[in-house]
């Protein structure tokens, strides 16, 4: 019998009945064995098929088998009830062999002419299966030319059967306080050839509780523990199961914070499997109670290892720790069932007593001594000689500790001396120099340096005088012997003051003129207001109404007098101002340059002469009476004038001190 | 982790101010605690002067009310302890630190100051 | 001022001992919000005080489990199970409960 082509010859080729396409003989026998490669098939179909018809095709016969199993047994021309003929079919080999059998009997009533086929090696699909048949593998399935591969789905692995998928579900950390975790693709069935390990682990202290939930479905056996497929919970005390069956396992309390659920699976099976929820428990905290004038929060039922609460205190307490401040407040509680701090109170706010104000004074108003959240103090100045600048004075004790004024200020208010009080007030009339009595210049300042000059108190810090009476002393203000509060030039009781800082007018060049001839001392401490001490105003910018030509100021100092010697008491005068254009004419003949006296100066005194200022008195206040606020202003600043003080036709020049208003007060406020 | 670095001159004349600055790193002093000020005399002896809270409210030894002083600049993170009219008996280690449930729980390494004419 | 007397001044020691200190104040430390706020400190040479134990009892961060405080009212005691070589120092106890805040003269741990 012909075998055929075999493997790796190219297999097809065409098979026919001995004598084709003439009548076959009798007693024939044909067998012809076709073998393909692996992984392939063989097609055979039937171009002419006319073989002596008899029932079940006993007498002649076309027969297809393949391994053990016949495929057909083919003759007649046409297939009746009980006999097949091939027609149009195609048949294919179960493997990759195909054996075909004729044969003829020992006669024929008719002449039949056989059979022609033809047949060709294809590659088998192992993909493809009949229905109702096991899948060729368990997730993907990839046919290639002569043969097949299995895949898998993310989170499985090929088993080494080469077909299974097994889950990959080890290694899976369950770190929250409660959770959920099910067998894989729950709740559709559970994958095969599997072994997974589940971990729940939770910090030291708490202890996880098991539930089973919704269904329960692992393989099971009737006589046998969990034979094929099983559920495994250990912790580090003791192991639960093995589970499997239909029915939920009870609630599995652990009383461990670590827990390992260990899911083995076999190869056969189709099971849905279990679905675990977990809690986790531990000893709980004593339960908060709020402190009075405060409230905790969240508030819950009980609070556990990692629970947390908060203290918020009302509006007008604070949270203090014993006495310690604090901002905020969380508790946490702890594994030994203790909270991780002490609780602390919410404590009336104490805005603690109120700061002393230089010159003024305070009053409890709510009640003495009362200084906690919402009480109320006055501050007030010293009458007379101060009045308070900014607020009314009025304090209240907030919630954040701080006294605080109507304005939200936290600052203290400022008690400003009253400036321009005297004890003298402007008769009208010219006469000549005279001595001061108590309080009528309490502005006056001596300046003992080099030599002798003045100034006036601004404020109760600073000095306005001459840049000229200073200029020495510029570098070294400490050296600078400052008086005040005092009538005698030599008594040994007056109130001293001592220079911090001495600023000089920037345009002011020594020697050269006394243009801008102003300075201003900063003292190093504030001294004390009262009537022999009282700073002068600076001039409002209506001053100019007050000092216009013929408008009488005054002019004091310890300066050189008519004997020429150095006042012992101060002195005074009261004198004119003087036509600018006059005045300036009076110093355009020598010996004193062109353009002596600049619009920064103003000149007073009278053309007869005898009134005048004179060395000793440079540096001092010309001063003026503002009858609208009754208040007495500094005009001019002792300057210079003619060699002879007193002259007939010369005039005492002083510095403008309108002109300076923007200096003074930056050096003022800058410093 | 919050840190504290005192500094300041380590000696200073009789009846002047002792001034000292304590530097936070790691944390602002706006934000929570009190900020103090201890010493520690020759002889070991530790003294509380005083804090400043968060808030910037202070609160002083009493015996030290009258020449004490703790104020802050919260935009360098410092606070500052001024102490006036020192006397030799103020010659000390000082320290500044930080208190939460407990006093001091965070501490400066501290700066000898010593007084001497 | 509350005075804090602290027993004995000097504790000789040799490693692995327990250690005990005893602090006594003049009056009861019990704030009035129910805490008390007693603390301990320890010192060595060169270095600033460290926080060991505060409110009684509980360890400040970082201080290992030997260390333990106890008392109540006006008498504390601070105990070290095994004293370690970086043990050695000065101890210091200090109360919080009243202003002014008051240390103890403190206990030299030394060894024997």
């Known amino acids: 019998t012909p075998l055929g082509p075999k493997w790796p010859e190219p297999v097809f080729g065409r098979l026919a009945s001995p004598g084709f396409p003439g009548e076959y003989a009798n007693d024939q026998e044909r067998r012809w064995t076709l073998t393909a490669p692996p992984g392939y098939r063989l097609r055979l179909y039937f171009t002419h098929f006319d073989l002596e018809l008899s029932h079940l095709c006993e007498y002649d016969f076309v027969k297809l088998s393949s391994g053990a199993k016949v495929l057909a047994t083919l003759c007649g021309q046409e297939s009746t009830d009980t006999e097949r003929a091939p027609g149009k079919d195609t048949f294919y080999s179960l493997g990759s062999s195909l054996d075909i059998t004729f044969r003829s009997d020992y006669s024929n009533e008719k002449p039949f002419t056989g059979f022609e086929a033809f047949y060709a090696a294809e590659d088998i699909d192992e993909c493809q299966v009949a229905p109702g048949e096991a899948p060729t593998c368990d997730h993907h399935c990839h046919n290639h030319l002569g043969g097949f591969y299995c895949s898998c789905r993310a989170g499985y692995v090929l088993h080494r059967n080469k077909r299974t998928c097994s889950a990959l579900c080890s290694g899976q950390v369950f770190t929250q306080r409660s959770g959920e975790l099910s067998s894989p693709e729950y709740p559709r069935p559970y994958p095969k050839l599997s072994s997974c390990t589940y971990s729940i682990s939770l910090e030291e202290g708490f202890s996880v509780i098991l539930d089973f939930v919704e269904s329960f479905d692992v393989e099971t056996h009737p006589e046998t523990l969990c034979p094929y497929d099983f559920l495994k919970i250990q912790t580090d005390r003791e192991e639960h199961g093995p589970f499997c069956g239909k029915t939920l396992p009870h609630r599995i309390e652990t009383k461990s914070n670590t827990v390992t659920i260990t899911f083995v699976t076999d190869e056969s099976g189709d099971h849905t499997g279990w679905k675990i929820h977990y809690t986790s428990t531990a000893q709980p905290c004593p339960y908060p109670m709020a402190p009075p004038n405060g409230h905790v929060s969240p508030v819950q039922a009980k609070y556990i290892l990692k629970d947390s609460f908060s203290i918020f205190c009302e509006t007008g307490y604070e949270l203090l720790q014993g006495h310690l401040p604090l901002k905020s407040f969380t508790a946490v509680c702890q594994k030994d069932g203790s909270w991780d701090r002490p609780m602390p109170a919410c404590s009336i706010v104490d805005c603690g007593p109120p700061d002393d104000l230089p010159s003024g004074r305070v009053e409890y108003i709510t009640g003495p001594g009362v200084t906690t959240y919402k009480a109320v103090i006055q501050y007030s100045c010293e009458e007379t000689f101060y009045t308070m600048k900014v607020n009314d004075g009025k304090y209240v004790c907030e919630a954040d500790g701080f006294w605080t004024s109507s304005k939200g200020e936290k600052s203290l208010p400022v008690c400003e001396p009253v400036c321009g009080l005297s004890a003298r007030t402007t008769g009208g009339r010219i006469y000549g120099g005279q001595k001061a009595k108590p309080g009528d210049f309490p502005w006056q300042v001596l300046i003992l340096g080099g030599t002798t000059a003045a100034g006036a108190l601004l404020y109760d810090n600073w000095v306005l005088t001459a840049a000229h009476a200073v200029y020495e002393q510029k570098h070294d203000a400490s050296a600078l012997d400052i008086r005040m509060g005092t009538l005698k030039r030599l008594s040994p009781h007056y109130t001293q003051a001592w220079s911090e800082a001495v600023f000089i007018h920037e345009g002011y060049t020594h020697d050269a003129g006394f243009d801008n001839d102003i300075a201003l001392i900063k003292l190093n401490n504030k001294v004390v207001i009262n009537s022999n001490i009282t700073p002068i105003c600076l001039p409002r910018k209506e001053a100019e109404s007050f000092m216009r030509t013929d408008d009488i100021g005054t002019a004091s100092g310890w300066g050189l007098t008519q004997r020429g010697f150095l006042a012992r008491n101060l002195m005074y005068v009261d004198i004119p101002i003087v036509d600018h254009q006059k005045c300036t004419a009076a110093y355009e003949k020598p010996p004193y340059p062109r353009g002596s006296v600049t619009a920064n100066m103003l000149c007073a005194g009278l053309e007869s002469g005898g009134k005048d200022s004179c060395r000793g008195d440079s540096g001092g206040a010309l001063v003026f009476l503002d009858s609208e606020t009754e208040r007495w202003f500094v005009g001019g600043i002792v300057s210079w004038g003619s060699m002879n003080c007193g002259e007939a036709g010369q005039y005492g020049v002083y510095t403008k001190v309108i002109n300076y208003i923007p200096w003074i007060e930056n050096i003022i406020s800058d410093f | 982790e919050v840190q504290l670095q005192e500094s300041g001159p380590g000696l200073v004349k009789p009846s002047q101010s002792l001034s000292l600055a304590c530097t936070v790193t790691g944390y602002s002093i706006t934000s929570d605690y009190a900020w103090h000020w201890i010493r520690q005399f020759p002889g070991n002896k530790l003294e509380w002067m005083g804090f400043i809270s968060y808030s910037g409210r202070t609160n002083y030894n009493p015996p030290l009310t009258s020449r004490i002083s703790i104020t802050r600049d919260t935009s360098k993170n410092q606070f500052f302890l001024q102490l006036n009219s020192v006397t030799t008996e103020d010659t000390a280690t000082y320290y500044c630190?930080?208190?939460?449930?407990?006093?001091?729980?965070?501490w400066g390494q501290g700066t000898l100051v010593t007084v001497s004419a | 001022n509350v005075l804090m007397t602290q027993t004995p001044l000097s504790l000789p020691v040799s490693l692995g001992d327990q250690a005990s200190i005893s602090c006594r104040s003049s009056?009861?430390?019990?704030?009035?919000?129910?805490?008390?706020?007693l603390e301990w400190y320890m010192q060595k040479p060169g270095q600033s005080p460290k926080l060991l134990i505060y409110?009684?009892?509980r360890r400040f961060s970082g201080v290992p489990d030997r260390f333990s405080g106890s008392g109540s009212g006006t008498d504390f005691t601070l105990k070290i199970s095994r004293v370690e070589a970086e043990d050695l120092g000065v101890y210091y106890c200090f109360q919080g409960s009243h202003v002014p805040v008051t240390f103890g003269a403190g206990t030299k741990l030394e060894l024997k």
């Open positions: 409110t009684v009892s």
């Open positions: 009056q009861s430390l019990v704030h009035s919000n129910g805490n008390t706020y």
């Open positions: 630190a930080r208190s939460y449930d407990y006093w001091f729980g965070y």
